[in-house]
């Protein structure tokens, strides 16, 4: 029971945490800045790894996208690389933690295959979670970075002059769901790995059948094992050959895929 | 690189008319807000008009209702067009753009090299 609450539970966060992934993704703010030295109107600037937007204090707002890939900074396609990946792996993730869901039966599928499942989703969602992680994290360093280079970064051309506006940096909302949505999805890949370990069905410690005579104590050991009697010093039928960790009888109050006779 | 270049400045007589054009060129994502300045000799420089890109402008007292700010967004373009025209505003005149610039993830702040608009008889 705990074992299904574990994966159902990771499965949930995780589905959460991928979901956080692409609504971060997608949206635009992931960086904004104020111009407040703006000589006109009000204007608030901000970006996604898609497209730029402006607003104006007038309630103008236009947003254009980056058609172009060679004028884009290399850490902007990286970060939109590492948020396209994690999203891709949860989405592979999901796809085979529905199958390997315990409350879920699909034919004749045994634990160990769902076993197999949970672990490799899990560590699905584990990837998935670091990738949007390290994703954001690389955003919000080239924002820091930007922020410091930018006092310095003035030239002459053409008789003009470039110069940077100084503006203040923030961090967008993206970021702190990207964040959030990682951190949750790392959490759920947890969770399926440690709920595999539950269903890992457990081996048995022996691999014959037990026959018992009718009318005697005796245990016949197919394979060559020693059989024994009810009598003398192994009187409560333990298995010679496994150190007498159980007893044949403690061994059979466990369910298990042996048929008794 | 981005390029902003001024044109349509000359001489002209007090009470005319003239047409100054502010074109930006270059690797540029998106041009914000567009504005003329304008410095005669020995003064400070000062704010003639400026538009955003939604189109609200703003004017200095000295100039308002006689000359018109206005822009192509399409084609990065701002015009000034000055009528009435005075003695006290010969000075030249530059333009000023802030721009936003994908390929630094920064905003820009560019300068033309200016047009001399001189008003005399």
């Known amino acids: 029971m705990a074992v299904t609450a574990c994966q159902g539970l990771g499965f949930v966060v995780s589905l959460i945490g991928i979901a956080g992934i692409i609504a971060a993704t997608c949206m635009d703010q992931w960086s904004t800045q104020d111009l407040y030295n703006n000589p006109v109107t009000a204007v608030f600037n901000y970006q996604g790894l898609w497209r730029s937007c402006v607003r104006e204090s007038s309630g103008f707002t236009e947003c254009r996208g980056y058609f172009t890939l060679l004028g884009l900074p290399a850490m902007l396609q990286a970060v939109r690389a590492l948020m396209i990946v994690g999203i891709v792996l949860g989405a592979i993730g999901l796809l085979v933690s529905i199958f390997a869901l315990k409350c879920i039966r699909i034919g004749s599928m045994e634990d160990s295959a769902k076993a197999n499942m949970t672990l490799t989703s899990g560590i699905m969602f584990i990837v998935s979670g670091l990738c949007a992680i390290a994703g954001v994290s690389v955003f919000a360093n080239m924002l820091v970075t930007n922020f410091w280079m930018s006092t310095a970064n003035m030239y002459t051309g053409m008789g003009g002059m470039v110069q940077t506006v100084q503006t203040r940096y923030t961090f967008g909302a993206a970021l702190f769901v990207g964040w959030v949505a990682g951190g949750l999805t790392l959490i759920g890949g947890v969770m399926m790995c440690i709920a595999c370990r539950g269903l890992a069905p457990e081996e048995t410690n022996y691999k014959a059948v037990s026959y018992h005579a009718s009318g005697h104590s005796v245990a016949y050991k197919p394979g060559g094992f020693k059989a024994s009697t009810g009598f003398g010093s192994n009187t409560k039928n333990k298995k010679i050959y496994d150190g007498g960790a159980r007893t044949e009888d403690e061994v059979q109050s466990y369910p298990s895929k042996h048929d008794y006779v | 690189e981005v390029q902003l270049v001024e044109s349509g400045g000359g001489l002209v007589q007090p009470g005319g008319s003239l047409r100054l054009s502010c074109a930006a060129s270059?690797?540029?994502?998106?041009?914000?807000?567009m504005v003329w300045y304008r410095q005669a000799p020995g003064k400070q420089r000062e704010l003639v008009a400026g538009?955003?890109?939604?189109?609200?402008?703003n004017y200095a007292h000295s100039v308002k209702g006689r000359f018109t700010i206005s822009r192509d967004n399409a084609k990065n373009t701002m015009y000034l067009q000055m009528n009435s025209l005075k003695s006290e505003d010969t000075a030249t005149y530059y333009c000023n753009a802030q721009a936003w610039d994908v390929g630094t993830i920064r905003y820009l702040e560019v300068w033309g090299q200016g047009t001399l608009v001189t008003v005399s008889a």
């Open positions: 538009i955003s890109r939604g189109g609200t402008t």
């Open positions: 270059g690797n540029i994502f998106r041009i914000d807000t």
